[in-house]
């Protein structure tokens, strides 16, 4: 039951985290105009990964996309790449983890296969979270560097426009969303990996059973699965249970007390 709970919680935490990573990536407030030196401005600037915006005090907001690709700073491109990789890995991880959930039965999928899938999705979530944290941290570092270098005619904005007025940018809401979301995805991934250990059958769980065939005696030793690479199961391996020896093809899947939450 604890394994199912850990796996389920890991899935939910990762789901929230990946939703947060997507939200952060789409948000426009990665950097916002620092108002410390000019708190009385009637125009407020903020920038995202994809566009920069200007909000006038009168309520009008105008956003312009970064339509150039080559003209953008390499660091911005790197941050975009990290966030997209994080989202893609997270999305694949979510897809895999849905099928790996112990509370969901798909045909006669073995716990060993679910363990493999759980581990795979956990690793994907961890990498996804790390990508998001790395992306946000790179951007934050870029902001800190630019903050102290924001003098006239210097590239301070992400759009690479020349400024004639000192406009400093500080951390926007998206950075905090990204950090928290990346952290959640990472935690969710770790929980999935922990759940995987509980799902994988241990060798000590199975006793060696003597199967008395007519004429001569053959001892079958256990071949229980451990978490291994790949999703597929080796159908030729034999699992020996107290109730007798059967090939995996013959084993029927019955609900156990752990199958439902």
């Amino acid at each position: 039951m604890a394994v199912t709970a850990c796996q389920g919680l890991g899935f939910v935490v990762s789901l929230i985290g990946i939703a947060g990573i997507i939200a952060a990536t789409c948000m426009d407030q990665w950097s916002t105009q620092d108002l410390y030196n000019n708190p009385v401005t009637a125009v407020f600037n903020y920038q995202g990964l994809w566009r920069s915006c200007v909000r006038e005090s009168s309520g009008f907001t105008e956003c312009r996309g970064y339509f150039t690709l080559l003209g953008l700073p390499a660091m911005l491109q790197a941050v975009r790449a990290l966030m997209i990789v994080g989202i893609v890995l997270g999305a694949i991880g979510l897809l895999v983890s849905i099928f790996a959930l112990k509370c969901i039965r798909i045909g006669s999928m073995e716990d060993s296969a679910k363990a493999n899938m759980t581990l795979t999705s956990g690793i994907m979530f961890i990498v996804s979270g790390l990508c998001a944290i790395a992306g946000v941290s790179v951007f934050a570092n870029m902001l800190v560097t630019n903050f102290w270098m924001s003098t006239a005619n210097m590239y301070t904005g992400m759009g690479g426009m020349v400024q004639t007025v000192q406009t400093r940018y500080t951390f926007g809401a998206a950075l905090f969303v990204g950090w928290v979301a990346g952290g959640l995805t990472l935690i969710g991934g770790v929980m999935m990996c922990i759940a995987c250990r509980g799902l994988a059958p241990e060798e000590t769980n199975y006793k060696a059973v003597s199967y008395h065939a007519s004429g001569h005696s053959v001892a079958y030793k256990p071949g229980g699965f451990k978490a291994s690479t790949g999703f597929g199961s080796n159908t030729k391996n034999k699992k020996i249970y107290d109730g007798g020896a059967r090939t995996e093809d013959e084993v029927q899947s019955y609900p156990s007390k752990h199958d439902y939450v």
Epitope: Q33, V43, Q47, V54, S58, G59, F60, G157, T167
Partner: antibody
Framework: QVQLQESGPGLVKPSETLSLTCTVS????????VSWIRQPPGKGLEWIGV???????NYHSTLISRVTISVDTSKNQFSLKLSSVTAADTAVYYC???????????WGQGTLVTVSS | DIVMTQSPDSLAVSLGERATINCKSS????????????LTWYQQKPGQPPKLLIY???TRESGVPDRFSGSGSGTDFTLTISSLQAEDVAVYYC?????????FGGGTKLEIK
């Protein structure tokens, strides 16, 4: 269509509080800001302050201690209160809507307020 | 506070001639985020409230004749009337719309020569 109309007493005694109302129609009070501007007789325009659609306000630094701008959305009205008035506060008072570029795109006709005992 | 200085104080131009009014701000009105100058021009005829002519230094308000044009960037701005008409006689004001307080220039009185 967008309309703004100022109203209030035409005569205020020195040291008293000047209270004016700007009744608006044709636009959402939560989507636009409204500025108050005054013009002493024969002189130029002086910006007093503004209340934005979100309820935040900004005032001229020289008047900040005496001025209050507020909104009553149920009545579609903005109000200006200027305390401790002197003869120097005698002017035509205008309210105007702040539009794109923070520019004042629609103005009321103005109301003359004289400060005299 | 940003100080707006207009020149000349008064200007007399013949009908059909070009009229040029200058406005200088003590600080730049150029916003780096959208590369727009937050300077506005108004026209005020006697006994009337001001009328918006140009915002963002060069964008004409709808309904304003195309003989009115605005130019300039940073701290120096110009309002140009390409061919003066009788109805253009008025006082013209520039305003800083970039930083509070949203100060006005002293005004330029335009007359017919």
């Amino acid at each position: 269509q967008v309309q703004l109309q100022e109203s209030g007493p035409g005569l205020v005694k020195p040291s008293e509080t000047l209270s004016l109302t700007c009744t608006v129609s044709g636009f959402s009070l939560t989507s636009y800001g409204v500025s108050w501007i005054r013009q002493p007789p024969g002189k130029g325009l002086e910006w007093i302050g503004v209340i934005w659609g979100d309820g935040s306000t900004n005032y001229h630094s020289t008047l900040i201690s005496r001025v209050t701008i507020s909104v009553d959305t149920s009545k579609n009205q903005f109000s200006l209160k200027l305390s401790s008035v002197t003869a120097a506060d005698t002017a035509v008072y205008y309210c105007a809507r702040a539009g794109r570029g923070n520019a004042l795109d629609y103005w009321g006709q103005g109301t003359l307020v004289t400060v005299s005992s | 506070d940003i100080v707006m200085t207009q020149s000349p104080d008064s200007l007399a131009v013949s009908l059909g001639e070009r009229a040029t009014i200058n406005c200088k701000s003590s600080q730049s009105l150029l916003n780096s985020g959208n590369q727009k100058n937050y300077l506005t021009w108004y026209q005020q005829k006697p006994g009337q409230p001001p009328k918006l002519l140009i915002y963002w230094a060069s964008t004409r308000e709808s309904g304003v004749p195309d003989r009115f044009s605005g130019s300039g960037s940073g701290t120096d701005f110009t309002l140009t009337i390409s061919s003066l008409q009788a109805e253009d006689v008025a006082v013209y004001y520039c305003q800083n719309d970039y930083s509070f307080p949203l100060t006005f220039g002293g005004g330029t009185k335009l007359e017919i020569k």
